[in-house]
Amino acid sequence: MDSFNYTTPDYGHYDDKDTLDLNTPVDKTSNTLRVPDILALVIFAVVFLVGVLGNALVVWVTAFEAKRTINAIWFLNLAVADFLSCLALPILFTSIVQHHHWPFGGAACSILPSLILLNMYASILLLATISADRFLLVFKPIWCQNFRGAGLAWIACAVAWGLALLLTIPSFLYRVVREEYFPPKVLCGVDYSHDKRRERAVAIVRLVLGFLWPLLTLTICYTFILLRTWSRRATRSTKTLKVVVAVVASFFIFWLPYQVTGIMMSFLEPSSPTFLLLKKLDSLCVSFAYINCCINPIIYVVAGQGFQGRLRKSLPSLLRNVLTEESVVRESKSFTRSTVDTMAQKTQAV
């Protein structure tokens, strides 16, 4: 949320909603950090530890299975997106500790804070892809029998990553460093050069493409899936479905504060009390969104324990059990009508 706004007396840091105020500069006169910043630091530290270790473990578990298990491909890509974002955390942490001073240079300013947005778009696009996969397994099992394969899954992931990179470009392009003098520091933020319309456009696109549209489509998608699942009283394990629903729900929960404050700030006058209050909460909103980068491994472990009854297995084998379950789609391309009927019933609960 970091824009250099030309009229704000306090500024943003590193993600991309606020506007660096180039005219009325920062008021950071206390040695002690604000409470929201302290909370953000605590969250960043936890997210980094859990996110790096947890996602590394998920990558390790799923990488071996990705050749043969489509679910492993989905979870592998989600973990890579989260792991990448976590790598920026030590830098962002250091910047907050130094009252948002950015001594890391212009290239780092463009790239590192943009990683969380890349993560946002990559995650939601991958979740949309996974959700489409769940939908097809339930409603088009014969199509899945014929066409659902690892190659197609990897192509879908590549498209998701490509679109995510494309959608992150505005943040990357508008991000600049600038020197501040009272007190002396370098700030990293987004500079919309007085263009409030452009700032609003970026915020609206981010809200719609990164939040509202996915929320609507995925809600509809899972409503259909769950209704079909319950109506068929499927006996098959709903393990993967439950995990995916939990991952999707957590995405929207943790991105909500960031999106709400971002859209509000783009429409508020930078000198307004509400804007200044939201500015102070900026780091906290970013850190809250960053929880997405460590929550998935936690969901997988909790889900694994739930399915096992209690934690009897080692962590890798528990994760493997959750993440690499293959949906009931036969390998053979030749099947009878009865096989299809049986399979259609079995896949209701996927």
Epitope: N23, T24, T29, S30, E179, P184
Partner: antibody, heavy 116, light 107 residues
Framework: DVQLQESGPGLVKPSQSLSLTCTVT?????????WNWIRQFPGNKLEWMGY???????SYNPSLKSRISITRDTSKNQFFLQFNSVTTEDTAKYYC?????????WGQGTTLTVSS | DIQMTQSPSSLSASLGEKVSLTCRAS??????LSWLQQKPDGSIKRLIY???TLDSGVPKRFSGSRSGSVYSLTISSLESEDFADYYC?????????FGGGTKLEIR
Amino acid sequence: DVQLQESGPGLVKPSQSLSLTCTVTGYSITSDSAWNWIRQFPGNKLEWMGYISYSGRISYNPSLKSRISITRDTSKNQFFLQFNSVTTEDTAKYYCARASIGFDYWGQGTTLTVSS
Amino acid sequence: DIQMTQSPSSLSASLGEKVSLTCRASQEISGYLSWLQQKPDGSIKRLIYAASTLDSGVPKRFSGSRSGSVYSLTISSLESEDFADYYCLHYANYPPTFGGGTKLEIR
């Protein structure tokens, strides 16, 4: 070594507009830092007026924002302070200074007297 | 705006004497404070920045310190060229403001 030198009209009448010039030698005003105007009133009180940064970004003291403007001529390595309408209250000695970590280099100052 | 209260406003001292000037900030300025020296000809020179860091070329007899919101400039042994006006300046936020000054005179 960085050197700053102010120049101005010296004496002006109230309501007139004027421009003060700061010429910088030994350092490019587009390299880094902020280039400031500060004034000292007859009672010795000092007041920061504003700056133009190396990138051209401008910041003013809110108490003066509507009355002054700071510009620069990078080809001559100069920056300027313009008043649109002076009053007798603007009688002071005007200094230009560089800010990097506080104000590290100062000019000698130029005295401006506003009198009818 | 942050108010910088400087004391004393004037001080008479002898050569070789040790003197201290103080500056109190009305709000936290986190050590973003400079001490400036203004000679009788009007020229201004920075002596100290970041509360206690000596500028290059400034004699070691000058030192800066901080105790809470009170900042001090100490001259350990006065020399003839030290008799001048001294100002503190904070640059912790906008606008930077100056102390009222201390006139250091020879006794």
